[in-house]
């Protein structure tokens, strides 16, 4: 029961995490204009991995995509790559983990196969989470560096009176979404790896032992251990896992043809 719960929770946490990584990657607010001494601005700039946007006080918002590939900073390209790798690994991990879930029966899949799949998806989630955290952290580092560089030459004089105020950028909402999402995916992956240990079949085989009493021939097969751990074919236990411990949302999430309640 604990293994199934750990596996299920790991899957859900990873699912939320990967959804968050996708959301962060698509978000426009990776960096936002620093409003240091002017909290009310007529023109507000913010940038994402794919486009930069300007929101005017008038309510008008204009976004422009980065249509060049070679002209973009190498760091931005690296961040994009890390986030995409994170999403791809996470998506594959989700696909693998769906089939690895204890509560879903596909044909006569062995427990050892499910354990291997759980471990594989767990590792994928861990790498996916690390990619997202790395990507967001690289971008954050880039922002911090640029922030202090622009602060150093905040006002560049242009012939006495005239001033050019340099726009400084600070952390946007996407960074925090990315960090949290990466962390969740990582935690989910660890949970899947922990669940894998419990899913692996026991090495010791409890063979049937015959006890011969005088006058009667009664064979006693101890099946209690297997039944209590939930790894046996005890239908009563199976019903609890499949029916009782599942929410309506989970029922919708998995195709009915794989459910044997």
């Amino acid at each position: 029961m604990a293994v199934t719960a750990c596996q299920g929770l790991g899957f859900v946490v990873s699912l939320i995490g990967i959804a968050g990584i996708i959301a962060a990657t698509c978000m426009d607010q990776w960096s936002t204009q620093d409003l240091y001494n002017n909290p009310v601005t007529a023109v507000f700039n913010y940038q994402g991995l794919w486009r930069s946007c300007v929101r005017e006080s008038s309510g008008f918002t204009e976004c422009r995509g980065y249509f060049t590939l070679l002209g973009l900073p190498a760091m931005l390209q690296a961040v994009r790559a890390l986030m995409i790798v994170g999403i791809v690994l996470g998506a594959i991990g989700l696909l693998v983990s769906i089939f690895a879930l204890k509560c879903i029966r596909i044909g006569s899949m062995e427990d050892s196969a499910k354990a291997n799949m759980t471990l594989t998806s767990g590792i994928m989630f861990i790498v996916s989470g690390l990619c997202a955290i790395a990507g967001v952290s690289v971008f954050a580092n880039m922002l911090v560096t640029n922030f202090w560089m622009s602060t150093a030459n905040m006002y560049t004089g242009m012939g006495g009176m005239v001033q050019t105020v340099q726009t400084r950028y600070t952390f946007g909402a996407a960074l925090f979404v990315g960090w949290v999402a990466g962390g969740l995916t990582l935690i989910g992956g660890v949970m899947m790896c922990i669940a894998c240990r419990g899913l692996a079949p026991e090495e010791t085989n409890y063979k049937a032992v015959s006890y011969h009493a005088s006058g009667h021939s009664v064979a006693y097969k101890p099946g209690g251990f297997k039944a209590s751990t939930g790894f046996g074919s005890n239908t009563k236990n199976k019903k609890i896992y499949d029916g009782g411990a599942r929410t309506e949302d989970e029922v919708q999430s998995y195709p009915s043809k794989h459910d044997y309640v």
């Epitope: 002017n38 023109v43 300007v54 005017e56 006080s57 008038s58 309510g59 005239v162 050019t164």
Partner: antibody, heavy 118, light 113 residues
Framework: DVQLQESGPDLVKPSQSLSLTCTVS?????????WHWIRQFPGNKLEWLAY???????NYNPSFKSRISISRDTSKNQFFLQLKSVTTEDTATYYC???????????WGQGTLVTVSA | DIVMTQSPSSLTVTAGEKVTMNCKSS????????????LTWYQQKPGQPPRLLIY???TRESGVPDRFTGSGSGTDFTLTISSVQAEDLSLYYC?????????FGAGTKLELK
């Protein structure tokens, strides 16, 4: 089409408060855009005073400090300007306006002339 | 606050003539985010509110004749009327649309010779 109409007193005594109303038709003030107050002195100089955001938050010209306040009544589709402790320097034509692309003002009221005199 | 300086304060012209008026800001009105200059031009006739002519320094508002052209970048801007008509004789203002408080120039008065 969007129309704005200012209303308020023609004459205000010094040290008193000036209250102006802008009635908007053809668009909801809580729908979108920012709604502004601008004044024009007798010598034609224009000065931006304040704005009321569609969300209800406001922003003021810092030169007025705590002398100015802006509010609204969404049920009547009106927004208001209050200027406290007026002096003869506040004699001007007061306009309400709605912002447009580029933070420009496309829609203006006809303006109301307010004279501050004892 | 950004100070807007308009020159000349008045211009005497003849119909059909090309007219140029200038506006200078104390700070750059260029926004690197969208590569646009936040300067607006208005025309005002006596007893009327200002009328929007040009925003983003060079974008003509719909209904504005194409004889009106806005140009410039950063801190120096120009409004050009290619061939002045009698109805163009009025006051012209430039406005800082880049940062609060929004500020206006003192205006350029266009008069007939």
């Amino acid at each position: 089409d969007v129309q704005l109409q200012e209303s308020g007193p023609d004459l205000v005594k010094p040290s008193q408060s000036l209250s102006l109303t802008c009635t908007v038709s053809g668009y909801s003030i809580s729908g979108a855009y920012n709604w502004h107050w601008i004044r024009q002195f007798p010598g034609n100089k224009l000065e931006w005073l304040a704005y009321m955001q569609y969300s209800g938050s406001s922003n003021y010209n810092p030169s007025f400090k705590s002398r100015i306040s802006i509010s609204r009544d969404t049920s009547k589709n009106q927004f208001f300007l209050q200027l406290k402790s007026v002096t003869t320097e506040d004699t001007a034509t007061y306009y309400c306006a709605r912002m447009y692309n580029g933070n420009s003002f496309l829609y203006w009221g006809q303006g109301t002339l307010v004279t501050v005199s004892a | 606050d950004i100070v807007m300086t308009q020159s000349p304060s008045s211009l005497t012209v003849t119909a059909g003539e090309k007219v140029t008026m200038n506006c200078k800001s104390s700070q750059s009105l260029f926004n690197s985010g969208n590569q646009k200059n936040y300067l607006t031009w208005y025309q005002q006739k006596p007893g009327q509110p200002p009328r929007l002519l040009i925003y983003w320094a060079s974008t003509r508002e719909s209904g504005v004749p194409d004889r009106f052209t806005g140009s410039g970048s950063g801190t120096d801007f120009t409004l050009t009327i290619s061939s002045v008509q009698a109805e163009d004789l009025s006051l012209y203002y430039c406005q800082n649309s880049y940062s609060y408080p929004l500020t206006f120039g003192a205006g350029t008065k266009l008069e007939l010779k």
